[in-house]
Amino acid sequence: SQVSQNCHNGSYEISVLMMGNSAFAEPLKNLEDAVNEGLEIVRGRLQNAGLNVTVNATFMYSDGLIHNSGDCRSSTCEGLDLLRKISNAQRMGCVLIGPSCTYSTFQMYLDTELSYPMISAGSFGLSCDYKETLTRLMSPARKLMYFLVNFWKTNDLPFKTYSWSTSYVYKNGTETEDCFWYLNALEASVSYFSHELGFKVVLRQDKEFQDILMDHNRKSNVIIMCGGPEFLYKLKGDRAVAEDIVIILVDLFNDQYFEDNVTAPDYMKNVLVLTLSPGNSLLNSSFSRNLSPTKRDFALAYLNGILLFGHMLKIFLENGENITTPKFAHAFRNLTFEGYDGPVTLDDWGDVDSTMVLLYTSVDTKKYKVLLTYDTHVNKTYPVDMSPTFTWKNSKLPNDITGRGPQ
Amino acid sequence: SQVSQNCHNGSYEISVLMMGNSAFAEPLKNLEDAVNEGLEIVRGRLQNAGLNVTVNATFMYSDGLIHNSGDCRSSTCEGLDLLRKISNAQRMGCVLIGPSCTYSTFQMYLDTELSYPMISAGSFGLSCDYKETLTRLMSPARKLMYFLVNFWKTNDLPFKTYSWSTSYVYKNGTETEDCFWYLNALEASVSYFSHELGFKVVLRQDKEFQDILMDHNRKSNVIIMCGGPEFLYKLKGDRAVAEDIVIILVDLFNDQYFEDNVTAPDYMKNVLVLTLSPGNSLLNSSFSRNLSPTKRDFALAYLNGILLFGHMLKIFLENGENITTPKFAHAFRNLTFEGYDGPVTLDDWGDVDSTMVLLYTSVDTKKYKVLLTYDTHVNKTYPVDMSPTFTWKNSKLPNDITGRGPQ
């Protein structure tokens, strides 16, 4: 049922759900700092626009009475719990900075009629797609899936002359929250990825993965996995790998590949890394000093969530429109706003668009080099290195099925 | 975290979660009546055993602030919500009469360390199997699955001389809660049923089901569905059905088939109905006057939950044992107690055992007749009618694959 909102008469409140369970193991204090930094910027922007209003955040903490704290696997009801707490206290703001856990967000939409805008730094799963009042500020699984299908089909680049239609997916259940949902989406039999591929098998055991690397009877040369180089090394070690194996390592929220002094270890030579185009603005930010690269993206998403609210608030106030309406709740999509780190584009469903970057290891320099970029907004690939110094034969990506000629 | 229990010094309380979302659309007032009737019996039994103690129930109602009320699909967090309410009020009893919805029960075990015994009239799904402190008093999906595998393999009865290894499953998403989880279990690729079958396809559209009935290229003659005769008629109507089609209609909680004046409609001739051996004790009960046959089972499970608690309380008190211990929480299994309707047996995992009955329509009398019974406790089938007057050729169930001879 509807709760009155602290969201009128020049006073606008943001309800921030501070969950014990989170997509990334980030101290809540850091997220508070990110929100507060965002608030400072929003207040400045509103004042700059001649809007003399008050914008504050209320941090709603779980009491820990019921929920096992930790990762997202036991988070399903925590968001609803906090929503009930807000409802009981009649402290609903204009917007919810909601759970980052897919289970939790999905449950909030399943169990309630959410007529408030909700902004999430996470909620990666396909089950959170197409929610009319949900905005997601970290690349959701659907975006990854569309890249992979696009890349698999590509056959007109100097370094990729074969369409692919097969894949192995390595998924052992120990993944981080982002990886868990990315791989879930690839595994789902009804997903776009599965629909477009002719063959796809999920490898769940380390041994299955290790065996495939040299198996002459393998059904695909391509293996998708998710995590960092260390994760791959733990699994692959220094094992020999057949020359036409391609490992796609999804590691979106890690910009270490772009640091100057980084050398790619030898075991990365058969690997293409998919990551996001790097940002650097948080390096000197007051709240980001102790953040790892991944957590930088997480904290940045919280900060950008505040800036997005400020952007929408400014537009509605300038147009003399009411904030506590369905129109406001449904407006957080199909737009570009100024994030902390530059413009942020949201698609028609409120999901962040970004530039994904596919990296390879140069056999000459042992450095990570950009092979191509992909714009999720237009679902288009842009080749960058037309003559990559690959490990693969003829500096071309192999066919996905050994012994199959050009199609 | 643990909450102090109202469960000592001669005063023993039962916490009954009265959910807005429920497995069966049963007025909560009727469930209260069932609980109160059970309490009267328990008090009498304890007094009769010379145990002068107080036993009461506290009914914990959802406030409806957050949750969409209705069926179980939006119930996931309601149980946890009530548990939080109990925790905050420090009103935990010795035992929880818990949610009937699978999602809700599963979530309570996922998100918390439940060290209280929980008794459920429902929680049918496989995800609630093997919970160490959960007792389920209505046949869970695992029991159905074991019957089906047993029956499929059977090939030594006069009326079933073929082992089956294939099936269609009709599942269109509009099922009642019990059916939803029964069919989910059959659909699950990792379930015992799927593991034991060579071919299984889920039909999700009415048209798919209707087409199979006369499709010469069908891969199986057997179709499992869940619901009552009316549900089947709405789907099948008076369409012609190939002579070797067998429809298995799962309708466990419906004893109308056993009423004297019931005639089987013509469209049921190709159908075997799986139901539970009927009870009649509730017909004259004060709380059951307005109950439909299905709801009789639901209310009875609540009543039996109270009797089960009384049974365990009596044993522990007579042995001088503490009630607020893990031993008590884990004791509600591998036992038989006196239910309202006769002895009730719980298996090693706290799930109710029962006698399932497979009915066919006699082509002579147009009556439902018992073909066989199945004891879930020993996983054994007992033929009843050795010369059934079937619609099928030679009064034998056909092979599951047309044209395949004896195996």
């Epitope: 922007r45 004042q47 700059n48 809007l51 650097n280 603005s281 000197n284 530059g342 | -």
Partner: antibody, heavy 119, light 107 residues
Framework: QVQLQQWGAGLLKPSETLSLTCAVF????????WSWIRQPPGKGLEWIGE???????NDNPSLKSRVTISVDTSKNQFALKLSSVTAADTAVYYC?????????????WGQGTLVTVSS | EIVMTQSPATLSVSPGERATLSCRAS??????LAWYQQKPGQAPRLLIY???TRATGIPARFSGSGSGTEFTLTIGSLQSEDFAVYYC?????????FGQGTNVEIK
């Protein structure tokens, strides 16, 4: 105290490319958009375009096809190139900092560079 | 683009008097409007933003008002250092646009 110091060629022939650079001293570079604004002699101010530390730009459509604004974060510098200049491009060119990120008004200005286009 | 029109082009005022400068936008800019002062040979200086908020270090005699399309800059009591050209600028949308300026001269 933030200071903007700009330099570049002051005299150009028609069809040449104007090239100016602005260096930022004493303040954060990443938290702002950095603009170029020009003022023809005896006339008003015209906004040319802006860039942030990530290289995201917004340009004035009236000049867009000829304008390139770039950034070098390692040096805290940004630059303007205006191709195919004509006499109409004669102006004092200012670099300026927005008062805050995306604020759109300018609280710190360079000293200005007079660029004359003459054959 | 949004066209900004200032009036009058020139305003002659005696020291100590009040000066009122007008700025009109071709479409609503809400309150996304700034005023600048420019003296000969110098870069412009930000006076007002948000239509009415004084920038850091700007004396109280400068005040701004208005919203939507009509804006006013008022200089309460003109000092000798206030004689200059004043520009309004909108920043509601891109491209940022300036008025053509009002020259405040000594009467």
């Amino acid at each position: 105290q933030v200071q903007l110091q700009q330099w570049g060629a002051g005299l150009l022939k028609p069809s040449e490319t104007l090239s100016l650079t602005c260096a930022v001293f004493g303040g954060s570079f990443s938290g702002y958009y950095w603009s170029w604004i020009r003022q023809p002699p005896g006339k008003g101010l015209e906004w040319i375009g802006e860039i942030n530390h990530r290289g995201n730009t917004n340009d004035n459509p009236s000049l867009k096809s000829r304008v390139t604004i770039s950034v070098d974060t390692s040096k805290n510098q940004f630059a303007l190139k205006l191709s195919s200049v004509t006499a109409a491009d004669t102006a004092v060119y200012y670099c300026a900092r927005e008062r805050g990120y995306t604020y759109g008004n300018f609280d710190h200005w360079g000293q200005g560079t007079l660029v004359t286009v003459s054959s | 683009e949004i066209v900004m029109t200032q009036s009058p082009a020139t305003l002659s005022v005696s020291p100590g008097e009040r000066a009122t400068l007008s700025c009109r936008a071709s479409q609503s800019v809400s309150r996304n409007l700034a005023w600048y002062q420019q003296k000969p040979g110098q870069a412009p200086r930000l006076l007002i933003y948000g239509a009415s908020t004084r920038a850091t270090g700007i004396p109280a005699r400068f005040s701004g008002s208005g919203s939507g399309t009509e804006f006013t800059l008022t200089i309460g009591s003109l000092q000798s250092e206030d004689f200059a050209v004043y520009y309004c600028q909108q920043y509601k949308t891109w491209p940022r646009t300036f008025g053509q300026g009002t020259n405040v001269e000594i009467k």
